[in-house]
């Protein structure tokens, strides 16, 4: 029995739970998901029983080995998987536990602008990047392009301070999760600040 194995999959994709055994006479292999039986295999008997019929088309054994491949992944496939190898030659079953996290492919992140002020020819605001559907485990970074050196900023909120007359800047939010990444539409500093340009002391949302 080894340490818990963490696996990552994407919705609609597939994941393989690796399993090896050098036991000669394996009587049965039992896979469970969150304590519910998933598959029972009897290698000598040549039988594979998938407990729930709807999972039959999703279960496979690459290259005829013991590893279990689960395809057409759904969000609710996330959880704890457990396998036991039972053999009369083993005093107790050989076991392995896995934790599966299934993530969605990220859609385009949405950017909103916070309160904007324009003082002494400098436009000051915050840009906030977020996912519309509240996806989990998303990491946000900002890319600021256009000045002498391109800059990166970690976090969903980007504070902006841009002086009129400076070269224009482009801001792009990058959203990442363990299986994908996506980019916001580019935002130009000049366009962003145009709304406040007429009134040097104005604030707007």
């Amino acid at each position: 029995s080894g340490p818990v194995k963490e696996l990552v999959g994407s919705v609609g994709g597939a994941v393989t739970f690796p399993l090896k055994s050098k036991v000669k006479q394996v009587d049965s292999i039992v896979w469970t998901f969150n304590t519910t039986p998933l598959v029972t295999i009897q290698p000598e008997g040549g039988t594979i029983i998938v407990t729930q019929n709807r999972n039959r088309e999703r279960v496979d054994f690459p290259d005829g080995g013991y590893s279990l491949k689960l395809s057409k992944l759904k969000k609710n496939d996330s959880g704890i998987y457990y396998v036991g190898i039972y053999s009369s030659s083993l005093q107790q079953p050989s076991t392995q536990e896995y934790v599966l996290h299934v993530y969605e492919h990220l859609s385009k992140p949405k950017v909103t602008m916070g309160l904007q002020s324009n003082k002494n020819g400098t436009c000051v605001t915050n840009l906030t990047c977020c996912m519309e559907h509240g996806e989990e485990d998303v990491i946000y970074t900002w890319k600021a392009l256009g000045q002498a050196a391109n800059e990166s900023h970690n976090g969903s909120i980007l504070p902006i301070s841009w002086r009129w007359g400076e070269s224009d800047m482009t801001f792009i939010c990058v959203a990442r999760n363990p299986v994908s990444r996506n980019f916001s539409s580019p935002i130009l500093a000049r366009k962003l600040c145009e709304g406040a340009a007429d009134d040097p002391d104005s604030s707007m949302v």
Epitope: K22, K24, G45, G46, I48, D63
Partner: antibody, heavy 120, light 108 residues
Framework: QVQLVQSGAEVKKPGASVKVSCKAS????????MNWVRQAPGQGLEWMGR????????KYQGKFKGKVTLTADKSTSTAYMELSSLRSEDTAVYYC?????????????WGQGTLVTVSS | DIQMTQSPSSLSASVGDRVTITCKAS??????VAWYQQKPGKAPKLLIY???YRYTGVPSRFSGSGSGTDFTLTISSLQPEDFATYYC??????????FGGGTKVEIK
């Protein structure tokens, strides 16, 4: 990648013996059953027996007990099939074939076959 | 020993046809049936094991079904490279394992 390479064709006289080899590579030889299957000219497939190289445990189909001896050399990852008291009806192509792990009676990798001709 | 009776022994079909081959076991073998494809002068190739599990790399047009004593191999749309001889094999419990007599799929 998994490969099973068999020894070359043999011509033998009735009553003689023949030993066919099957060299395995690309997997853990000692942990998978190795089967032997024969096919007479223009005929179907006939399972002869299997051996577990890890401990040399061998199982035979009834009609081949005493006629076939299966052995394995772990140091060279080679399985052997010896056929004794040859008769003309033993003329066939002999295949070695590895068992899958998940269903040990199903055979996923096969050697290229060795033709044994028994003729006086 | 368990006998495997395969039918038909030969059939003629055209590219694109749906082809069905059946195999009957002389006693209950649960779902322990494999299917192989063999071309002249070549070793057999595993297509299906445990009645319905496609082996890695086998095209999805090949499917297997059945349990107990009655089993079927279906080729949903026959391709030029599928003209060959097909064998069923029971791999139930302890050996001996036995093969069906084979079905030769020929070009119509």
């Amino acid at each position: 990648q998994v490969q099973l390479v068999q020894s070359g064709a043999e011509v033998k006289k009735p009553g003689a013996s023949v030993k066919v080899s099957c060299k395995a590579s690309g997997y853990t030889f000692s942990s998978s059953w190795m089967n032997w299957v024969r096919q007479a000219p223009g005929q179907g497939l006939e399972w002869m027996g299997r051996i577990y190289p890890g401990d040399a445990d061998a199982k035979y189909q009834g009609k081949f007990k005493g006629k076939v001896t299966l052995t394995a050399d772990k140091s060279t990852s080679t399985a052997y099939m010896e056929l004794s008291s040859l008769r003309s009806e033993d003329t066939a192509v002999y295949y070695c074939a590895r068992s899958t792990m998940i269903a040990t009676g199903a055979m996923d990798y096969w050697g290229q076959g060795t033709l044994v001709t028994v003729s006086s | 020993d368990i006998q495997m009776t395969q039918s038909p022994s030969s059939l003629s079909a055209s590219v694109g046809d749906r082809v069905t081959i059946t195999c009957k076991a002389s006693q209950d073998v649960s779902t322990a049936v494999a299917w192989y494809q063999q071309k002249p002068g070549k070793a057999p190739k595993l297509l299906i094991y445990s009645a319905s599990y496609r082996y890695t790399g086998v095209p999805s047009r090949f499917s297997g079904s059945g349990s107990g004593t009655d089993f079927t191999l279906t080729i949903s749309s026959l391709q030029p490279e599928d003209f060959a001889t097909y064998y069923c094999q029971q791999h139930y419990s302890t050996p001996p394992y036995t093969f069906g007599g084979g079905t030769k799929v020929e070009i119509k």
